[in-house]
């Protein structure tokens, strides 16, 4: 409400090398495994350095007053604006993990804002009205986050809370059962 | 340049076999998860199957289940589909196509071959 | 019939701005990225918009895609007669675990 933005500068969310989250696990099946247990290659990051500003998660910084009809702050408060994209960049070996990352589609992440902070501000108010104080809700951090497959759009969940990290020289083991089995446990897959 | 290149198609009769397969030239083969997509004469497209980059994830779409089988070998560059017990329905352009990137597509496409299924 | 619903034909005159739509459900555009694809007449298709607003090297700046809920569209702005074109739709579909394409839109540049 009345927000007024003066500065401007943005911090990517860019985890180091080998802490990118993997998607989180997917119900395997009979259909979609065929897996070689000793085909793979070596190890690589799941992510082309180069490629990963193309899809990072970015938090923009903007300071701001706060305004209530004609009562402004008495000082700016700093919040973030998350921008950007989320997924895998290039296909290597390692992006698969238990997620289907070499799919031409799938799993759309969104980079949404994850925590939040409250700060008071004291709102001055023109024509000798007494100052206000007001709390209000900020974006702390952004998170990649999951539109999830069969709830509604708005409803998000983490992109690697519950996110199997590949190990190291390993492949996941597959997990064979039938999805259409089980749908609700699908349904709270993600 | 980056090329795939389908052949193996033909007239077969329903019920036979048909073997296609795809040449790439141009690029890192096993950087590339591969598809097999088809259009049928003045349809859209369709999916057929895909496979990553060494053959240990595959899918089918339902109407070729148990019927086609895709595989690839990395070290000739080749893509292939067996085609078995195959119907009228199946006559189709079949194209190869590839993605490297993830979720970003199918951004490599052959020329297509066609498969003719008719008695 | 399609699990992806798109129109099948849309037109505009040079210089317009055109957009084409694509439907589906939870289990496909829901919760996955869509892709775009373009069909010259003839040829193969073409890759124009990925992960539901990307687009790759060499493709024009005129076309945009974007996606809200279980619809995804297409914009083409500053409609050109090499436009003409049919365009599909895709994403994958997690209960029938395929990837799926809309029927196609056949683009007139009249």
């Known amino acids: 409400q009345g927000w007024q933005a003066f500065k401007n500068d943005a911090t990517e969310i860019i985890p180091e090398l080998g802490e990118y989250p993997e998607p989180p696990p997917e119900l395997e099946n009979n259909k979609t495994m065929n897996r070689a247990e000793n085909g793979g290659r070596p190890p690589h990051h799941p992510f082309e350095t180069k490629d990963v500003s193309e899809y990072s998660c970015r938090e923009l910084h903007f300071t701001r007053y706060v305004t209530d009809g004609p009562c402004r702050s008495a000082k700016p408060v700093t919040e973030l604006v998350c921008s950007g994209q989320c997924g895998p960049a290039r296909l290597l070996p390692n992006a698969i993990g238990r997620g289907k990352w070499w799919r031409p589609s799938g799993p759309d992440f969104r980079c949404i804002p994850d925590r939040y902070r409250a700060q008071r501000v004291q709102l001055l108010c023109p024509g000798g009205e007494a100052p206000r104080a007001r709390k209000v809700r900020l974006v702390a951090s952004c998170k990649c986050k999951r539109l999830t497959r069969f709830h509604n759009q708005s409803e998000l969940k983490d992109f690697g809370t519950e996110a199997a990290r590949p190990q190291k020289g390993r492949k996941p083991r597959p997990r064979a059962r039938s999805a259409k089995a089980n749908q609700a446990e699908l349904e709270n897959a993600y | 340049e980056v090329q795939l290149v389908e052949s193996g198609g033909g007239l077969v009769q329903p019920g036979r076999s048909l073997r296609l397969s795809c040449a790439a030239s141009?690029?890192?083969?096993?950087?590339?998860?591969l598809h097999w997509v088809r259009q049928a004469p003045g349809k859209g497209l369709e999916w057929v199957s895909g496979i990553s980059w060494h053959g240990d994830f595959i899918d089918y779409a339902d109407s070729v289940k148990g019927r086609f089988t895709i595989s690839r070998d990395n070290a000739k560059n080749s893509l292939y589909l067996q085609m078995n017990s195959l119907r009228v329905e199946d006559t189709a352009l079949y194209y190869c196509a590839g993605n490297n990137r993830g979720y970003g597509g199918l951004d490599v496409w052959g020329q297509g071959t066609t498969v003719t299924v008719s008695s | 019939q399609s699990v992806l619903t798109q129109p099948p034909s849309a037109s505009g005159t040079p210089g317009q701005r055109v957009t084409i739509s694509c439907s589906g459900s939870s289990s496909n555009i829901g919760g996955n990225t869509v892709n775009w694809y373009q069909q010259l007449p003839g040829t193969a298709p073409k890759l124009l918009i990925y992960?539901?607003?990307q687009r790759p090297s060499g493709v024009p700046d005129r076309f945009s895609g974007s996606k809200s809920g279980t619809s995804a569209s297409l914009a083409i702005s500053g409609l050109q007669s090499e436009d003409e074109a049919d365009y599909y739709c895709a994403a994958w579909d997690d209960i029938l675990e395929s990837y799926v394409f809309g029927g196609g839109t056949k683009l007139t540049v009249l």
């Open positions: 141009g690029f890192t083969f096993d950087d590339y998860a």
């Open positions: 992960s539901n607003n």
